[in-house]
């Protein structure tokens, strides 16, 4: 027989065996010009030594073949032998350590064969109803196609779809969609009408996400507040990836999740902008408000489940960062400026009560006084920290208000709030006698010994009626009793207690009368 | 060599079915192309259908497009021929054959043949 044409004789090799997991496969006939065909065909296996013959049945029942070598592409003329008007049957054997393997056929008419491409370049996936759907530009001359799909999972092999037949510019395909297992997909085409005509080859890989991306598992810690006011926010552990099929690994356009940090500061109500998104792989500086923290996931789909948690605010105080002035016209404070042009967020509210029922305020960007100080006044009128109660007071700076991640804490403390002079005068108090000589007085905690770091000393005052010559005692802010020696018998006393703080004097207490009496001896 | 064998013939009444099945001895089987003829006696023998090792490719002569219905479980070796709505027409012994070769139409030579089972229709 000669190489050009179909040789109509027994092939040179014994039967085939088509059971073997190895072997041809994806045969594919069609014309590729006005007189001139070609098949192709895969080979699964080992090559070495792999001889592929092209077999074909014709409708007159008599049957030949090409001898194709190692090849696993051939072509013929429509003078081979081989009648290309009628309908013909064509499979591949493969003659390997003495062995044949044996592709499935394909029954077809060769003339009306025409080669169809696979969906080529871009193939848009969105949802629909639950489905996915895929929509591609149809190959250019290749309008009226018949169109299948495959697909699978990580953990389960390749499973057909039929996507119907399709007449248009632009072809599309509804698919299951899994919850949460990505997909791969491919497609291919055949034409449309002309029984038995090859499948095109599969298209490339099309990387589907679930519906639903995986939930977020991650874990947070916080560094402690530096000496800048700020706080790195740090993740302990990663988000776990996702399992992808096969033909997804490596580069899988189509199945990335994204990861988002969203921060909200609770802290500080009155400025302009609350929460802001980052990605999760920059991980910010927090100043040492409080935040919520949420990590959302999302694919091509959307949005996932998210995870949150709260990051607390940190209460480490600084008791003499800021200084409390009270004149006539207002209260003004004072602290230490932390550069030009700066905003501050002032808050405040009261000890002990639910966080959100903080009160701030805002300033307009200032620069450092001469002193390198920053301020902020306001009048008894505005009512601000009006009330004689403790008051947590926390200011924020930033340069850039806007942008919540660059806010940084210059100092939290505690204030008593209204007149703290008087409010914080010492009740109840008393003396008893302690011997000859001495007297014991107690009295009350002042308001201000509620609001840490707020009550500088106690001090007591103590005068003797007959000689007006008077004394005072400083007593430390924990202590609510003090001793007073070197009294004479006989003589009124009167004693009082003041509460001061470190801007201000206290108001005295009501005085109280007393005295040692005389002991007369027997 | 493949060695088929017949069964599942029988006696039933027009418009009644039958499943006939063609069993083969080699695993080989499973590369091979089936079709079953029948044959009446005095007349040649006649194509019925055709099946490709696959299973992708089947052939039916006219005479039974639409009532017959032939496929394949290749890991029993076994190929069946369902036949629906049968007539006294197609009354005669029915012969399963198999070839490396699948045929595209009624046309072709097959290698291997079975012994044949008698199927009776009665009006």
């Known amino acids: 027989c000669r190489t050009s044409e179909c040789c109509f004789q027994d092939p040179p090799y014994p039967d085939a065996d088509s059971g073997s997991a190895s072997g041809p496969r994806d045969l594919r006939c069609y014309r590729i010009s006005s007189d001139r065909y070609e098949c192709s065909w895969q080979y699964e296996g080992p090559t070495a030594g792999v001889s592929h013959f092209l077999r074909c049945c014709l409708s007159s029942g008599r049957c030949c073949y090409f001898a194709a070598g190692s090849a696993t592409r051939l072509q013929f003329s429509d003078q081979a032998g081989v009648s290309v008007l009628y309908t013909v049957t064509l499979w591949v054997e493969s003659w390997a350590r003495n062995q044949t393997e044996k592709s499935p056929e394909v029954t077809l008419q060769l003339y009306n064969s025409v080669k169809y491409e696979p969906p080529l370049g871009d193939i848009k996936v969105s949802k629909l109803a639950g489905q996915l759907r895929m929509e591609w530009e149809t190959p250019d001359n290749q309008v009226g196609a018949e169109v299948q799909f495959r697909h699978r999972t990580p953990s389960s092999p390749w499973k057909l779809g039929d996507c119907g037949p399709q007449d248009d510019d632009t072809e599309s395909c509804l698919c299951p969609l899994e919850m949460n297992v990505a997909q791969e997909f491919q497609l291919r085409r055949r034409q449309l009408g002309s029984q038995g005509s090859s499948w095109s080859k599969w298209s490339s890989p099309v990387c589907v996400p679930p519906e639903n991306p995986p939930q977020p598992q991650v874990r947070f810690s916080v560094e402690q507040l530096g000496q800048d006011g700020r706080r790195r926010l740090t993740l302990k552990e990663q988000p776990t990836q996702l399992e992808l099929p096969e033909g997804c690994q490596g580069l899988a356009p189509g199945t990335e999740v994204t990861y988002r940090l969203q921060l909200h500061m609770l802290s500080c109500p009155c400025k302009a902008k609350a929460t802001r998104t980052l990605h999760l792989g920059k991980m910010p500086y927090l100043s040492g408000a409080a935040y919520n923290v949420a990590v959302i996931s999302s694919n091509q789909f959307g949005p996932g489940l998210n995870q949150t948690w709260h990051i607390p605010a940190d209460t480490h105080t600084e008791p003499v960062a800021l200084n409390i002035s009270v004149g006539t016209n207002g209260t003004t404070m004072y602290w230490p400026a932390r550069a030009q042009s700066m905003t501050y967020c002032i808050e405040w509210q009261p000890v002990g009560q639910d966080g959100g029922l903080a009160t701030c305020s805002l300033t307009a960007p200032q620069d450092p006084d001469p002193a390198g100080m920053a301020t902020y006044s306001w009048s008894r009128e505005s009512g601000a920290m009006g009330q004689e109660k403790c008051y947590y007071i926390t200011i924020f700076a930033s340069a850039h208000p806007e942008k919540l991640t660059l806010w940084s804490t210059v100092l939290s403390t505690y204030h008593f709030g209204g007149n703290a002079s008087a409010a914080g005068t010492p009740h109840h108090v008393s003396v008893k006698n302690h011997s000859l000589d001495s007297v014991s007085v107690d009295w009350a905690p002042s308001l201000l010994s509620t609001c840490p770091g707020v009550l500088k000393e106690y001090v007591v005052r103590c005068r003797d009626e007959d000689s007006k010559q008077v004394s005072e005692h400083p007593v430390q802010p924990t202590e609510t009793q003090v001793t007073l020696s070197g009294l004479r018998a006989g003589v009124a006393y009167t004693v009082q207690v003041r509460a001061d703080t470190a801007w201000l004097r206290g108001v005295w207490s009501q005085p109280q009368r007393f005295s040692i009496e005389v002991q007369v001896s027997d | 060599q493949v060695q088929l064998v017949e069964s599942g013939g029988g006696l039933v009444q027009a418009g009644g079915s039958l499943r006939l099945s063609c069993a083969a001895s080699a695993r080989i089987f499973n590369s091979y192309a089936v079709a079953w003829f029948r044959q009446t006696p005095g007349k040649e023998r006649e194509f019925v259908a055709s099946?490709?090792?696959?299973?992708?490719?089947?052939n039916y002569a006219d005479s039974v497009k639409g009532r017959f219905t032939i496929s394949r479980d290749n890991a029993k070796n076994t190929v069946f021929l369902q036949m629906n709505s049968l007539k006294p027409a197609d009354t005669a012994v029915y012969y399963c054959?198999?070839?490396?070769?699948?045929?595209?139409?009624?046309?072709?030579?097959?290698?291997?043949w079975g012994q044949g089972t008698q199927v009776t229709v009665s009006s």
């Open positions: 099946i490709s090792w696959s299973g992708g490719s089947t």
């Open positions: 054959a198999a070839d490396r070769n699948y045929y595209p139409s009624v046309l072709g030579k097959y290698t291997y």
